[in-house]
Interface confidence: low
């Protein structure tokens, strides 16, 4: 029998290459049967994960999922980093594993790779 | 019934670039995530990475320099870009859909594969 | 990387045996993701179990698997014909994706 629990679809050591300057939409995917949980974003610092408060988040619906998004309008440099997501449902916590962004910044960058390039080559994880 | 189909070059030169094509028909490819694994000759099984239809994606870092997996829903498909080819590479490529269940990740519906060989 | 082993490499056995499978991860998977596949020779892998115990749809009662942490079975209660095959474990606790190098269960 399928769980009715909700759960969070992020993989551990998940990741995302993104550029400063760039729109990006960091997405938490969300399964739930009826009532829809409350989830929120945090960032992680050191051991401590930091809510944020006040960010444009918003709900994407699908057909066999639901995604919380975090919107970064720009991205910053200072964006750089591990988040999580986190629903509250009847009354318990449930987290997802990290998501890490590795952000590039541009002015810094002597040549931007095209994006075919930095998809094929995300070399900042595992480097 | 869902159903996947790989198509592409069955030959590919030593350092050119392998290209793959996976049409997926009987469904959508929208609201699923879409994967690609690979199996040399008579060996085991290498996932390659995977795709959401959004186009976010994860690779296997051991192929992660040479890999590009896109998706392009008005066509039902995605594809799968390989660099760099050596004799290593001849495998059997196959495209699958991926399952969430629980907190996990399954393949439950898979291409029959198209064996691509690495040979000048 | 998560690491998969599966034991033995070839297990011999007649039509009607109990087949019991082994898969042991480097490091701990929890039981939520692990998964069993069936290979048939010139076929694509066939979902069998997810979640270390749950059986995929169509899957017949014979097959069910266990274990928790790092290690994990398949038990095929009673061969059949159809069942002599390569079986491969799954982990996706991890990125990357790994699979076990596979169990040929052969006739004896």
């Known amino acids: 029998k399928e769980s009715c629990d909700v759960q969070l679809y992020i993989k551990r050591q998940s990741y995302h290459s993104i550029f400063a300057g760039d729109p990006f939409k960091l997405e938490c995917p969300v399964k739930y049967c009826a009532h829809r949980p409350q989830v929120t974003w945090c960032k992680l610092n050191g051991t401590t994960c930091v809510k944020l408060e006040g960010r444009h988040t918003s709900w994407k619906q699908e057909k066999n999922l639901s995604f919380f998004i975090l919107h970064f309008e720009p991205v910053l440099p200072s964006d750089n980093g591990s988040y999580r997501c986190s629903a509250n449902f009847l009354s318990a916590i449930i987290e997802s594993h990290s998501t890490t962004l590795y952000v590039t910044d541009v002015k810094s960058a002597s040549e931007r790779p095209s994006k075919d390039e930095m998809a094929s080559r995300p070399w900042l994880l595992y480097s | 019934q869902v159903q996947l189909q790989e198509s592409g070059p069955g030959l590919v030169k030593p350092s050119e670039t392998l290209s793959l094509t996976c049409t997926v028909s009987g469904g959508s490819i929208s609201s699923y995530y879409w994967s690609w694994i690979r199996q040399p000759p008579g060996k085991g099984l290498e996932w390659i990475g995977y795709i959401y239809y959004s186009g976010s994606t994860n690779y296997n870092p051991s192929l992660k320099s040479r890999i590009t997996i896109s998706v392009d829903t008005s066509k039902n498909q995605f594809s799968l870009k390989l660099s760099s080819v050596t004799a290593a590479d001849t495998a059997v490529y196959y495209c699958a859909r991926v399952i969430l269940y629980s907190s996990g990740w399954s393949f439950d519906y898979w291409g029959q594969g198209t064996l691509v060989t690495v040979s000048s | 990387e998560i690491v998969m082993t599966q034991s033995p490499a070839t297990l011999s056995l007649s039509p009607g045996e109990r087949a019991t499978l082994s898969c042991r991860a480097s490091?701990?998977?929890?039981?939520?993701?692990l998964s069993w596949y069936q290979q048939k020779p010139g076929q694509a892998p066939r979902l069998l179990i997810y979640g270390a115990s749950t059986r995929a749809t169509g899957i017949p009662a014979r097959f069910s698997g266990s274990g928790s942490g790092t290690d994990f079975t398949l038990t095929i209660s009673s061969l059949q014909p159809e069942d002599f095959a390569v079986y491969y474990c799954?982990?996706?606790?991890?990125?990357?994706?790994?699979f076990g190098g596979g169990t040929k269960v052969e006739i004896k």
């Open positions: 490091q701990s998977v929890s039981s939520s993701y």
């Open positions: 799954q982990q996706d606790y991890n990125l990357p994706l790994t």
